[in-house]
């Protein structure tokens, strides 16, 4: 029942792992139903070493997994949203359209 895709573990350094918190800091509610309004810490890797990680997508840090993932823009996929999905036509399709 577990499916994992496009996830990268940021390198752990000691000071980071010692900085545990009782609760992630929340943004004010609102926007996108308030979902993902949490979790905007100074140590968010998406704002540091992973800020340019997602080529055609949005970097997201998942605290539970201590991992970074990319939410790709439409038509892009891959670990870093660097691959574009191409719509291909078969030989039959192209011959029918002539």
């Amino acid at each position: 029942s577990v499916r994992v895709e496009q996830v990268v573990k940021p390198p752990q350094n000691k000071t980071e792992s010692e900085n545990t918190s009782d609760k992630p800091k929340r943004k004010k509610k609102g926007g996108k139903n308030g979902k993902n309004r949490r979790n905007r810490k100074k140590k968010n890797p998406c704002n540091a070493e992973f800020q340019n990680f997602c080529i055609h997508g949005e970097c997201k840090y998942i605290e539970h997994l201590e991992a970074v993932t990319c939410k790709c823009q439409q038509e892009y996929f891959g670990e870093r949203c660097g691959e574009k999905s191409m719509k291909t036509h078969s030989m039959i399709d192209s011959s029918l359209s002539k």
Epitope: E5, S17, T20, D22, P24
Partner: antibody, heavy 125, light 112 residues
Framework: EVQLVESGGGLVKPGGSLRLSCAAS????????MSWVRQAPGKGLEWVST????????YYPDSVKGRFTISRDNAKNSLYLQMNSLRAEDTAVYYC??????????????????WGQGTLVTVSS | DIVMTQSPDSLAVSLGERATINCKSS??????????LNWYQQKPGQPPKLLIY???NRESGVPDRFSGSGSGTDFTLTISSLQAEDVAVYYC??????????FGQGTKLEIK
């Protein structure tokens, strides 16, 4: 086969301390966030604490914050809950639970997919 | 905090009949068309068991008479044809990334 086995429960006086343990087996422990959930006698489920895969992030409800501390030892496949300043209202069966998850298209969906049998904590003078 | 409220508190249904349990959240648990809502079954003397995750996905091994539906703030667990072994307490739980990770108060399902 995934197994979670809690231990450390018992009778303790108000203001006392107790340390619960959860021994995990049958899965890659350091790939999953883990939680403690409790259930007072005859009552519903109450989330108590969560810890991230490597222990860098911990979460608590206001009811236990400052009194309870969750930790994990990935080398020993073990989860812990240190409970201090215990109160009568902390009396409950404490369950250890694994966070199963789906991660796709930038979305993270999680749920408690495996639970231990629980350990009873009784706080009474 | 997101508050989860289940209805009814208890329910008696005849064997073979449909059972419906509702769960309402104090604010939306949806994001971009995804619902962050799970259902659990707890039989007497046992730990809870995951039935449905992400509102409508049945956990492996769960009989297909169990189904989940809904979005936003309103969700439903349906048992299409009640069996004797379905007698239990059922809980909904929101699994947004926002703690506290709250449960509903539970619905006790019995046989009429």
């Amino acid at each position: 086969e995934v197994q979670l086995v809690e231990s450390g429960g018992g009778l303790v006086k108000p203001g006392g301390s107790l340390r619960l343990s959860c021994a995990a087996s049958g899965f890659t422990f350091n790939s999953y966030a883990m939680s403690w959930v409790r259930q007072a006698p005859g009552k519903g489920l109450e989330w108590v604490s969560t810890i991230s895969t490597g222990g860098s992030h911990t979460y608590y409800p206001d009811s236990v914050k400052g009194r309870f501390t969750i930790s994990r030892d990935n080398a020993k496949n073990s989860l812990y809950l240190q409970m201090n300043s215990l109160r009568a209202e902390d009396t409950a069966v404490y369950y250890c639970a694994r966070h199963g998850y789906l991660l796709y298209d930038g979305y993270y969906e999680w749920y408690f997919d495996y639970w231990g049998q629980g350990t009873l904590v009784t706080v009474s003078s | 905090d997101i508050v989860m409220t289940q209805s009814p508190d208890s329910l008696a249904v005849s064997l073979g009949e449909r059972a419906t349990i509702n769960c309402k959240s104090s604010q939306s648990v949806d994001y971009d068309g995804h619902s962050f809502l799970n259902w659990y079954q707890q039989k007497p003397g046992q730990p809870p068991k995951l039935l449905i995750y992400a509102a409508s996905n049945r956990e492996s091994g769960v009989p297909d008479r169990f189904s989940g539906s809904g979005s936003g703030t309103d969700f439903t667990l349906t048992i299409s044809s009640l069996q004797a072994e379905d007698v239990a307490v059922y809980y909904c739980q929101q699994s947004t990334e926002d703690p506290p990770y709250t449960f509903g108060q539970g619905t006790k399902l019995e046989i009429k």
